[in-house]
């Protein structure tokens, strides 16, 4: 069985300020389990944008159900964009465990914030 | 508002131990990396010791083996263990919320920590 | 461990002159380096990230330029406010974060 691909298609997303951004994330197989994490940043200090287990996102909601097991679509939408959201934004795959490891990381989105449409 | 409050700095002799905390408030902490600072007197800032936000840790040269940088999201609280202390530890210690492109945005008032004996 | 070299040590301006700054890395950092603004018994502010760009709540008189391992911070007219030490920051590289040994500004 071929191994789990992380696919983010949009390499990169221009969203106006003050519309929603939608950054699409799929993966390739239900193996192995475990949750699927947003980050803005790649490195140490990246920023947890999204958890799919658990935490406190009151800007972002999933585009499909995440919830359901059969679910393969991590797609977001961050509702009210502002320059300050910008950067490259990674969809990540964990494995289930005590704690959840790192499994597979997708490429990246590069989210750019253009200035409000006057 | 954000706020990062320190507190454990102390006075302490060679080889003895310390524990710091920070207490953040005004942002979702889970959902950061954190980090320790330390600036001795006189000179620059100094960075100790980072934990993301999977808990993963990271440390100066000067530091590794004997700090221990660790959170609790349930409490919004960072802590740096401090073992086997020398007289080069003398510093202030100062908490930073640090972003995913790697600038120090907020910062503590710190904590003094004098290692004398 | 890009090692970040400032200078000149002190800087003794009268207000209303220009501040001129430099920070010099030992290898390229890009656009990412960042100055902070440490005033007596406080802890480091954030002025300026990516080179240029002003953090939230600086003043326009703030201004950073350069890129790869040669940056510079203008206070183009120093108010008597602006008496602090300034250290600049590399931002590209991770662990560890540097910071230069800084600059101490002072109003005559």
């Known amino acids: 069985e071929e191994e789990l691909q992380v696919i983010q298609p949009d390499k990169s997303v221009s969203v106006a300020a003050g519309e929603s951004a939608i950054l699409h994330c799929t993966v390739t197989s239900l193996i192995p389990v475990g949750p699927i994490q947003w980050f803005r940043g790649a490195g140490p200090a990246r920023e947890l944008i999204y958890n799919q287990k658990e935490g406190h996102f009151p800007r972002v909601t999933t585009v499909s159900e995440s919830t359901k097991r059969e679910n393969m679509d991590f797609s977001i939408s961050i509702s009210n964009i502002t320059p300050a959201d910008a950067g490259t934004y990674y969809c990540v795959k964990f494995r289930k465990g005590s704690p959840d490891t790192e499994f597979k990381s997708g490429a990246g989105t590069e989210l750019s914030v253009r200035a409000k449409p006057s | 508002d954000v706020q990062l409050v320190e507190s454990g700095g102390g006075v302490v002799r060679p080889g003895e131990s310390l524990r710091l905390s920070c207490a953040a408030s005004?942002?979702?902490?889970?959902?950061?990396?954190m980090t320790w600072v330390r600036q001795a007197p006189g000179k620059g800032p100094e960075w100790v010791s980072l934990?993301?936000?999977?808990?993963?840790?990271y440390y100066a040269d000067s530091v590794k083996g004997r700090f221990t940088i660790s959170r609790d999201n349930s409490k919004s609280t960072l802590y740096l263990q401090m073992n086997s202390l020398r007289a080069e530890d003398t510093a202030v210690y100062y908490c930073?919320?640090?972003?995913?492109?790697?600038?120090?945005?907020?910062w503590g008032l710190g904590t003094l920590v004098t290692v004398s004996s | 461990e890009i090692v970040l070299t400032q200078s000149p040590g002190t800087l003794s301006l009268s207000p209303g002159e220009r501040a001129t700054l430099s920070c010099r890395a030992s290898?390229?950092?890009?656009?990412?380096l960042a100055w902070y603004q440490q005033k007596p018994g406080q802890a480091p502010r954030l002025l300026i990230y990516?080179?240029?760009s002003r953090a939230s709540g600086i003043p326009d008189r703030f201004s950073g330029s350069g890129s790869g391992t040669d940056f510079t911070l203008t206070i183009s007219s120093l108010q008597s406010e602006d008496s602090a030490v300034y250290y600049c920051?590399?931002?590209?590289?991770?662990?560890?974060?540097?910071f230069g040994g800084g600059t101490k500004v002072e109003i005559k």
């Open positions: 930073a919320k640090i972003t995913w492109n790697n600038l120090f945005d907020y």
């Open positions: 934990v993301s936000v999977t808990a993963t840790t």
């Open positions: 990516d080179s240029s």
């Open positions: 005004g942002f979702t902490f889970s959902n950061f990396a």
């Open positions: 290898q390229t950092v890009g656009s990412k």
């Open positions: 920051q590399q931002h590209n590289d991770w662990p560890p974060y540097t």
